[in-house]
């Protein structure tokens, strides 16, 4: 097979015919050294999945349910290109499965038992698989056959295409459960009509169904959405209140050696030449031979799936949970309202050691999961492999954009016993230099810089945001002669100053000696001209407070702060000489786990928090000898957020605006994936 050939998998005679036409027409418009199409015919989409995994084919387009099959071992395929619908300006690659109710009803998601339900059809995504998958563990046992369990859960339903003889309750609201538009309650509009007519109490549909059926906002305002956290939201707020986000139609390929760049090159060229309204002789998104061949007829084009986005992230935690429940039919032994152990995400092996120690001291209430970077940890929390971690504000922003929520804030200044209920204002992000140097904020160009890590607040977002507004470009590695900013490209000048050791050089975790606040300060001490850190860093590492060899003889007066007005001040004056105020680090979790995480952590800090005086012979949660492992070492307590329970409210408008501006310079693959 030539290197540049994409073997497309077709699942019927008609698809094979269209594939051959696709191949021939692409040959006519692409250069001979460009990508080419070859066609492989298989009996089913599952056979195509297996063929791609076995390297007998390269690509196929699948519905969400099959993307799940493709991702499961041993297939291990991943999404590489998404079809989009709607306009190029506002491309839709996902739809949201929602539960719609009338505003004047008064029940929540956890009170659906005994209500009347309206479904689009048996076995359909938004109307059946997702809601029933998510409700699966609340269904009465035995849960097989599923239709019987559902019939016993709701007091009456309309489930088009169900067997009305065996399960009459599923057809109570639409006698016969007709499987076509002859049934007035069939499909999306039908399920909504079932609710509208008052036959049912809840309709499981797509987010767009309400808008398609009610043009008038006043009419739409008579309805609400049920959210998974047992609240309700307006029908406009479907992005924050849905059962699952469902990808529409996706091209998948092998995770390793999958030719994803080639597939994208091919499809990008294909949409240019044969996309909507492009060509008379061949159309990518329609066919005389049948409906939805190779691609959906309703598609308007393709978008490249960001490389960081694996199938778990693409399908989303809720969707995977629903499908896994339905497929595997397993439920936790504990009732769902009971808190299971919280899986903490530890960064590299230093944090893992502390987490293991915490785990055994917590009597197993805390479990540990590891990842090599903060972004990998956030991804693990998103997909349910982990539950929580404490993050710098820059990563609270990324986590928030990825759907996680802040749960508790680290407090650094408030003494107990008021600490737990106090909302602190934050800490100061500062620029530290040696007293002996002549540096000011205005002559940093060409100097050596030390950063906690790319994407972190004091070490990156604040100083680089200020710098960006001065230089109007993102080439920070050209502004400084060299530096250490863990998380930068390995060949960048901003990795040149890092200490490693070797395979971990410039990695954004504790294996890199110049990582974090203490690491960035060490970088200044040993090699750099300026360090971007928190205002407490110099006092915490001088005057013998850090006994490590590099720090034990350091004096506070040998360092000064750079002020934005071009002056310098003592490290004792951060309130009058700082770059900006930074939001405190915060614990984040998935919405569904937030309450459990909060309850458990408040309990854990009562046992292992700052009230423990002897950390040499007891486990201390907020202590790791200047390494800031799991939490900042200067944490006094974890504090409740009260109403600051979204990332925007927690970080504050000013900081969110600053980070959003800096996104032009973003090197975050996770942020790119989460905003896809």
């Amino acid at each position: 097979v030539p290197e540049k050939s994409v073997r497309w998998c077709a699942v019927s005679e008609h698809e094979a015919t269209k594939c051959q036409s696709f191949r021939d027409h692409m040959k006519s418009v692409l250069p001979s050294n460009g990508p080419s199409v070859a066609c492989v015919k298989k009996a089913s989409h599952l056979d195509c999945i297996r063929a791609i995994a076995a390297n007998e084919a390269d690509a196929v387009t699948l519905d969400a349910g099959l993307v799940y099959d493709a991702y499961l071992a041993p297939n291990n395929l991943k999404p590489v290109v998404a079809e989009f619908y709607g306009s190029k300006e506002d491309p839709q690659t996902f739809y949201y499965a929602v539960a719609v109710v009338k505003k004047d009803s008064d029940f929540q998601m956890n009170q659906l038992r005994g209500r009347k339900s309206c479904h689009t059809g048996l076995g359909r995504s938004a109307g059946w698989n997702i809601p029933i998958g998510l409700l699966y563990c609340d269904l009465p046992e035995p849960r097989k056959p599923l239709e019987k369990a559902v019939a016993n859960f709701f007091s009456g339903s309309c489930v088009p295409c169900a067997d009305g003889t065996d399960f009459p309750q599923l057809c109570q609201l639409c006698p016969g459960c007709g499987c076509s538009t002859l049934n007035q309650y069939f499909s999306y509009s039908g399920a909504f009509k079932c609710l509208k007519d008052g036959a049912g109490d809840v309709a499981f549909v797509k987010h767009s169904t309400i808008f398609e059926n009610l043009a008038n906002k006043a009419d739409r305002d008579q309805y609400e959405l049920l959210c998974l956290d047992n609240t309700r939201k307006s029908v406009d707020e479907y992005k924050d209140c849905h059962l699952a986000r469902v990808p529409s139609h996706t091209v998948v390929a092998r995770s390793v050696g999958g030719k994803e760049d080639l597939i994208w090159e091919l499809l990008n060229q294909a949409q240019e030449h044969f996309g909507k309204d492009k060509s008379k002789e061949f159309q990518l998104f329609s066919s005389p031979h049948g409906k939805d061949l190779l691609f959906k007829d309703s598609a308007h084009g393709f978008l490249k799936v960001p490389p960081r986005m694996d199938a778990k992230m693409y399908l989303g935690y809720e969707y995977i949970t629903a499908i896994r429940n339905l497929r595997e039919g397993t439920c936790p032994e504990a009732p769902t309202d009971e808190c299971k152990p919280v899986k903490w995400c530890a960064l590299s092996h230093h944090e893992r050691l502390k987490c293991d120690e915490w785990s055994v001291n917590s009597a197993g209430k805390i479990e540990c999961e590891s990842a090599e970077t903060t972004e990998d940890c956030i991804a693990k929390i998103m997909n349910g492999e982990a539950d929580a971690m404490s993050l710098d504000g820059g990563f609270v922003y990324i986590a928030g954009m990825c759907g996680l929520v802040p749960v508790l804030a680290e407090n650094y200044n408030t003494p107990n016993p008021n600490c737990e209920n106090t909302a602190e204002e934050g800490y100061f992000a500062v620029a530290v230099v040696k007293s002996s140097s002549d540096l000011t904020w205005d002559n940093l160009k060409g100097k050596k810089s030390c950063h906690t890590a790319v994407g972190r607040t004091a070490g990156w977002n604040i100083p680089m945001g200020l710098l960006y507004s001065k230089i109007n470009h993102c080439r920070f590695d050209e502004f400084f002669s060299e530096g250490c900013a863990p998380g930068s490209e390995k060949n960048s000048s901003l990795c040149k100053l890092c200490m490693g050791p070797s395979p971990n050089l410039c990695e954004p975790n504790n294996k890199e000696g110049y990582y974090g606040y203490t690491g960035a300060f060490r970088c200044l001490v040993e090699k750099g001209d300026v360090a971007f850190v928190k205002h407490q860093t110099v006092p915490q590492n001088t005057g013998g407070k850090n006994p490590d060899a590099w720090a034990k003889n350091l004096k506070e007066e040998d360092y000064e702060l750079l002020c934005l007005d071009g002056s310098r001040k003592s490290v004792q004056e951060p309130a009058n000489c700082h770059l900006a105020r930074a939001p405190n680090h915060a614990v984040v979790a998935r919405k569904d786990k937030a309450d459990c995480v909060q309850t458990l952590l408040l309990d854990q800090q009562r046992m292992f928090g700052s009230s423990v005086t002897d950390c040499s012979s007891n486990f201390c949660l907020f202590e790791s000898k200047t390494k800031d492992l799991l939490f900042r070492d200067d944490t006094v307590c974890l504090a409740k957020l009260h109403d600051r329970n979204t990332y925007e409210k927690y970080l504050g408008e000013e900081y969110v605006k600053a980070v959003t501006n800096l996104r032009k310079c973003s090197t975050s693959p996770l942020l790119e994936a989460c905003t896809f």
């Epitope: 230093h350 050691l353 120690e357 055994v360 040499s616 012979s617 486990f619 790791s624």
Partner: nanobody
Framework: QVQLVESGGGLVQPGGSLRLSCAAS????????MGWYRQRPGKQRELVAA???????NYADSVKGRFSISRDNAKNTMYLQMNSLKPEDTAVYYC???????????WGQGTQVTVSS
């Protein structure tokens, strides 16, 4: 700071048993948490088992029901009883008292356990 020395490793057949010891140079009474870790070839060091002064224990899923951790404060020694050994238990085993030197990667020599027929 107490020094820890591991011993008791060796070559054993699948299904066999070994008992590892971790002897401390000073009192372990004041040490809250101790643990056993292992490093398999080409892999990260991973937790095998841990124990607190109060007797809480924790085990990796892969060894639950086969390994047992204990400590004898009077003898300043911690133990790992390993039963029903499998080839995948082959590794260098290290003990730790979770003191700050472990944040500096300052581990002892460890003791080699090889499970092979």
């Amino acid at each position: 700071q107490v020094q820890l020395v591991e011993s008791g490793g060796g070559l054993v057949q699948p299904g066999g048993s070994l008992r590892l010891s971790c002897a401390a140079s000073g009192s372990i009474f004041s040490i809250n948490t101790m643990g056993w870790y292992r490093q398999r070839p080409g892999k990260q060091r991973e937790l095998v088992a841990a124990i607190t002064r109060g007797g809480n224990t924790n085990y990796a899923d892969s060894v639950k029901g086969r390994f047992s951790i204990s400590r004898d404060n009077a003898k300043n020694t911690m133990y790992l009883q390993m039963n029903s050994l499998k080839p995948e238990d082959t590794a260098v085993y290290y003990c730790t008292d979770y003191s700050r030197r472990y944040y500096q990667d300052d581990w002892g020599q460890g003791t080699q356990v090889t499970v092979s027929s």
